[in-house]
């Protein structure tokens, strides 16, 4: 009915779209909840975050385990009162993902 | 402060976080604006979409050129009146990206 090769290609594509940790670039300032006058160079870093598809609409791809990766970045405060400082940051890195039910929404939220 | 080799690697990392086409998985039904009684198997496909960081907060990573990729998927209509059919779908694939100013927000929007 369907040729094996086509089914194989479809299945491989499907596997690649599944919920799993994927390399993503995250903006450090918003990640750390920094004030708008604080900037980082580079402003973004690559870490793994959960992404991809779940089989059912009621499920969402969520992290089940997280580690925190150590990075060093230049922090720049505006107005520029001092030389950019090399500061340590710890960025969340998703190490495990799962399709989980979306949190039940409160009718008044 | 840093040797040339380290600065080169830092720059390479920064380049990797920049606005560019990135492999992303998209949900076909919502992409094609299908009715809620039409499903695809697999429900998601991998294509390239613009993503990554821009140097300024006022800029957003946007697509400047797009191609359309043909994928073969099973289309399932509910209630199940016939056998799932293998159909070709064309999904937008971003081939060029640029950091562009965010659309000016209308005061009443």
């Amino acid at each position: 009915f369907y040729d094996i090769e086509t089914l194989k290609v479809i299945d491989e594509e499907w596997q690649r779209t599944q919920c799993s940790p994927r390399e993503t670039c995250v903006e450090v300032a918003s990640e750390l909840g920094k004030s708008t006058n604080t900037f980082f160079k580079p402003p973004c870093v690559n870490v793994f975050r959960c992404g991809g598809c779940c089989n059912e609409e009621s499920l969402i791809c969520m992290n089940t385990s997280t580690s925190y990766i150590s990075k060093q970045l230049f922090e720049i405060s505006v107005p520029l009162t001092s030389v950019p400082e090399l500061v340590p940051v710890k960025v969340a890195n998703h190490t495990g993902c799962k399709c989980l039910p979306t949190a039940p929404r409160h009718p008044y939220s | 402060f840093y040797d040339i080799e380290t600065l080169k690697v830092i720059d390479e990392e920064w380049q990797r976080t920049q606005c560019s086409p990135r492999e992303t998985c998209v949900e076909v039904a919502s992409e094609l604006g299908k009715s809620t009684n039409t499903f695809f198997k697999p429900p998601c496909v991998n294509v390239f979409r613009c993503g990554g960081c821009c140097n300024e907060e006022s800029l957003i990573c946007m697509n400047t050129s797009t191609s359309y990729i043909s994928k073969q998927l099973f289309e399932i209509s509910v209630p199940l009146t016939s056998v799932p059919e293998l159909v070709p779908v064309k999904v937008a694939n971003h081939t060029g990206c640029k950091c562009l100013p965010t659309a000016p927000r209308h005061p009443y929007s």
Partner: antibody, heavy 118, light 113 residues
Framework: DVQLQESGPGLVKPSQTVSLTCTVT??????????WNWIRQVSGNKLEWIGY???????VSNPSLKSRISITRDTSKNQLFLQLNSVTTEDIATYYC??????????WGQGTTLTVSS | DIVMTQSPSSLAMSVGQKVTMSCKSS????????????LAWYQQKPGQSPKLLVY???TRESGVPDRFIGSGSGTDFTLTISSMQAEDLALYYC?????????FGSGTKLEIK
Amino acid sequence: DVQLQESGPGLVKPSQTVSLTCTVTGYSITNRYHWWNWIRQVSGNKLEWIGYISYSGDTVSNPSLKSRISITRDTSKNQLFLQLNSVTTEDIATYYCARDGGIYFDYWGQGTTLTVSS
Amino acid sequence: DIVMTQSPSSLAMSVGQKVTMSCKSSQSLLSSPNQKNYLAWYQQKPGQSPKLLVYFASTRESGVPDRFIGSGSGTDFTLTISSMQAEDLALYYCQQHYSTPYTFGSGTKLEIK
């Protein structure tokens, strides 16, 4: 000079909850870019990281202990606390608090010994 | 979790001899964007808490004698004592600070022959 001093009950009974305190002097625990850690050392000299509380109050714990521990702080007293629930003889160790500047543990306390016995 | 494997577990050396101990991690400790290895070495003398010797795999902490030399990158690291002194009798631990949960090696016990 930065100093860390741990204190605790010393002896607890199995299944009880224990609370350990780390008092920091010479440095504010809310100073940016420092994380305040709990580390334990069992009799075989094995060092095990328990978790930290950050300068902003966020906590991260070792998944192997996560369900049994809680790390909190009192910024007015410049103290951090470790609460360990349902203790067993496997929790017998010297408990250290240590400061982390994002790269390494630069200051350690002298440690407090926890003994679990009925 | 990142597993840290130290070897040997103990070694007995004479004063003045060169001492070498190894530490291997189960994954790379090289962090971007600064391209530093998040590996530290600590010395623990009997009855004391651990003391930092080396960080970023090869940067000596201030006040640490220059006979302590850290080297390596990625997953393979070494601590060398160029000329052992009697006061170096201690336990030596490597520790990864790359990602939580932070993990330590099981230690190398240095004894005097």
